[in-house]
């Protein structure tokens, strides 16, 4: 399980001639919001096909009114990320549709009207847990700039969110065959499905259905503490078979040999048998030389001065890694303070600051009650140069903008799935139902049972695609 996150950076006229007219006017002020639809794989499905990986709506952006005679600028955007939770494995390859919607705020009968301004689509490969990927897409004369990533929700880890992590059983290291869960170094990778009843504290498995015991435990489910009296030798057979308590970690525990090397103990330490192409004490040295052209992206290969570094790639600006294979993401330097969102624009770093913070690195705290509002009826309380909001019932968060779990009351009808959302909640309806709360059945002939203008929903509302 995990979350796909989409951050919209800008939406405005693309380069070149034929700038689009502003979607809003003094007579018709409007605001933008976005919808993202995700599908697994690289299939080019129709926009209307189900968003099998999930979908999300953004909050509404600030109200915008065109200045007469001015060209359409980048339009003001909603705050926050669009988040699409996924329940199963992250597929690695996916298709996306991002729609930009306009909400007109004039005096229409029946409330605001929605219309689709632009739709972009694409197919991408993406590993979960990786850095933000940046993208620019054009739709007609409009240009959308955005970043996206997929991250796993604990205890899942890995590029597909299929590995699980659990707290370490032993204080110093993980059990045999289990690796630390980077970056959660205090947790260990946990196998997916062990034999039923296998002790979660003292057992583990490398194949589904097995139950292997950690040192000091034995029995078919690793629930029996071993006796210490029947040891055959100082490092005799495994505790799982003999009931013998094995002494502390041996030099090969955790396999110090890199790159697929196999470890064997020696009287003083250990020895690695390295696969072809690697050597060194821990098989950490690659046998590749500059003749093999190992440097990517224009990196300059220099032969190492000794066998330990058969070559070194001197990377051109903008690239890093032992083979210059990685584009430098300067956001990896963590330059933004106070939860600011980092954007590496190539020519410069930018930090998009959270409300209440300012400065090129979001280092300045603007927090005091002067000129500061707590949303939804909250009141601002000053103290020590900072501020906090005392929120009205049903709201929480720093500025009282967050509803207190809007899904708790199970508001989505007919088996719809509820997602807590910046602007309240969003219902993902079961097949055959639609509406803000999935309250309207869709007739088999395609006509909907919508009333003429239900409050807060129109037939064109993008929620009907969720």
């Amino acid at each position: 399980a995990g979350v796909f996150e989409l951050q919209i950076h800008s939406f405005g006229p693309g380069p070149g001639p034929g700038a689009p007219r502003s979607p809003c006017s003094a007579r018709l002020p409007c605001r933008l919001f976005f919808r993202v639809c995700l599908k697994p794989g690289l299939s080019e499905e129709a926009a209307e096909s189900p968003c099998a990986l999930g979908a999300a709506l953004s909050a509404r952006g600030p109200v915008y009114t065109e200045q007469p005679g001015a060209p359409a600028p980048d339009l003001p955007l909603p705050d926050g990320l669009l988040q699409v939770p996924f329940r199963d494995a992250w597929p690695g390859t996916f298709s996306f549709i991002i729609e930009t919607w306009r909400e007109e705020l004039g005096d229409q009968i029946g409330g605001p009207a929605w219309s689709l301004l632009a739709r972009v689509a694409g197919r991408r490969r993406l590993a979960a847990g990786g850095p933000w990927a940046r993208d620019i897409q054009r739709a007609g004369a409009w240009e959308l700039r955005f970043s996206y990533r997929a991250r796993c929700e604990p205890p899942a880890v890995g590029t597909a969110c299929t590995r699980l992590c659990r707290p370490r059983s032993a204080p110093s290291r993980c059990g045999p065959g289990l690796r630390p869960c980077a970056p959660l170094e205090d947790e260990c990778e946990a196998p997916l499905v062990c034999r039923a009843g296998c002790s979660p504290e003292h057992g583990f498995c490398e194949q589904p259905g097995e139950c292997r015991c950690l040192e000091g435990w034995t029995g078919p489910l690793c629930t029996v503490p071993v006796s210490t009296s029947s040891c055959l030798s100082p490092r005799g057979p495994s505790s799982a078979t003999t009931g013998c308590l094995v002494p502390g970690p041996g030099p090969c525990d955790g396999n110090p040999c890199a790159n697929g090397g196999s470890c064997s103990e020696t009287p003083r330490s250990f020895e690695c048998t390295c696969p072809r192409g690697f050597y060194g004490l821990r098989c950490e040295v690659s046998g590749v030389t500059c003749a093999d052209g190992p440097c990517f992206n224009g990196g300059l290969c220099v032969g190492g001065a000794d066998p330990d570094s058969a070559y070194i790639c001197h990377c051109p600006p903008g690239f890093q890694g032992s083979n210059c294979e990685k584009r430098v993401d300067r956001c990896s330097l963590q330059p933004c303070r106070n939860g600011g969102l980092c954007l590496d624009l190539g020519h410069a770093l930018r930090c998009r600051c959270r409300a209440g913070f300012a400065g090129p690195r979001c280092e300045h705290d603007l927090d005091d009650c002067a000129g500061r509002a707590c949303a939804n009826g909250g009141t601002c309380v000053e103290g020590g140069g900072a501020h906090r909001c005392s929120c009205a019932l049903g709201f929480g968060g720093r500025d009282c903008r967050e509803r207190a779990d809007p899904c708790a009351a199970r508001p989505c009808a007919h088996g719809g799935r509820c997602y807590a959302h910046f602007s309240g909640l969003v219902c993902a309806c079961a097949p055959g139902y639609m509406g803000a709360r999935c309250e309207f059945p869709v007739h088999p002939d395609g006509a909907s049972a919508l009333p003429a203008a239900p409050p807060g929903l129109r037939p064109g509302d993008p929620q009907r695609y969720l």
Epitope: P131, A182, P183, L333, Q334, P335, R361
Partner: antibody, heavy 117, light 107 residues
Framework: QIQLVQSGPELKKPGETVKISCKAS????????MHWVKQAPGKGLKWMGW????????GYADDFKGRFAFSLETSASTAYLQINNLKNEDTATYFC??????????WGQGTSVTVSS | DIQMTQTTSSLSASLGDRVTISCRAS??????LNWYQQKPDGTVKLLIY???HLHSGVPSRFSGSGSGTDYSLTISNLELEDIATYFC?????????FGGGTKLEIK
């Protein structure tokens, strides 16, 4: 207050491995990247690279690729520098330093590594 | 890589003097220039970041200026505790690079 406390001096032989620790306190460890700087005896400062404390991803300057490895123990708010297959020219003081978005604003006291046969 | 040059490797001055240490970059570094002080015991402290901003806890007698490729650190009223080596460092482009240092001594 913010502090970076490094492990003590090390005396090693060529070919051995050393692992230096840098324990941070007084701030949220995963909010700031950690950087490593080398100073050979009587010489200036040389930036070695950094590690992203949120993701664990390191970045190395060209001269420190191969035998050098940055790592973390996030639960202990500690960053590590490991140097494998030590050489005489690795004799230096190694500093860890926190990066605040503009500069390395707090530094460890330095760890002296002497490589001698 | 961007080269940082501190032309003066050592400097003697009297207590109370106004001292200026200069630093030049091999290309425009857009004000991403920092100054560090290394005391004789080896401890390193940030003095000035982003050309002219004083780090917290640093006495106001320290100031920084410059733009483009040329930058300087000024100590307006030299005190005994300022005896140290001063390094400039550019943070505009990876890899970050330091100047060779300027050692400040008392006459």
């Amino acid at each position: 207050q913010i502090q970076l406390v490094q492990s003590g001096p090390e005396l090693k032989k060529p070919g051995e491995t050393v692992k230096i620790s840098c324990k941070a306190s007084g701030y949220t460890f995963t909010d700031y990247s950690m950087h490593w700087v080398k100073q050979a005896p009587g010489k200036g400062l040389k930036w070695m690279g950094w590690i992203n404390t949120e993701t664990g991803e390191p970045g190395y300057a060209d001269d420190f690729k191969g035998r050098f490895a940055f790592s973390l123990e996030t639960s202990a708010s500690t960053a590590y520098l490991q140097i494998n297959n030590l050489k005489n020219e690795d004799t230096a003081t190694y500093f860890c330093a926190r990066y605040d978005g503009y500069a390395m604003d707090y530094w460890g006291q330095g760890t002296s590594v002497t490589v001698s046969s | 890589d961007i080269q940082m040059t501190q032309t003066t490797s050592s400097l003697s001055a009297s207590l109370g003097d106004r001292v200026t240490i200069s630093c030049r970059a091999s290309q425009d570094i857009s004000n991403y220039l920092n100054w560090y002080q290394q005391k004789p015991d080896g401890t390193v402290k940030l003095l000035i970041y982003y050309t002219s901003h004083l780090h917290s806890g640093v006495p106001s007698r320290f100031s920084g200026s410059g733009s483009g490729t040329d930058y300087s650190l000024t100590i307006s009223n030299l005190e005994l505790e300022d005896i140290a080596t001063y390094f400039c460092q550019q943070g505009d482009m990876l890899p970050w690079t330091f100047g060779g240092g300027t050692k400040l001594e008392i006459k």
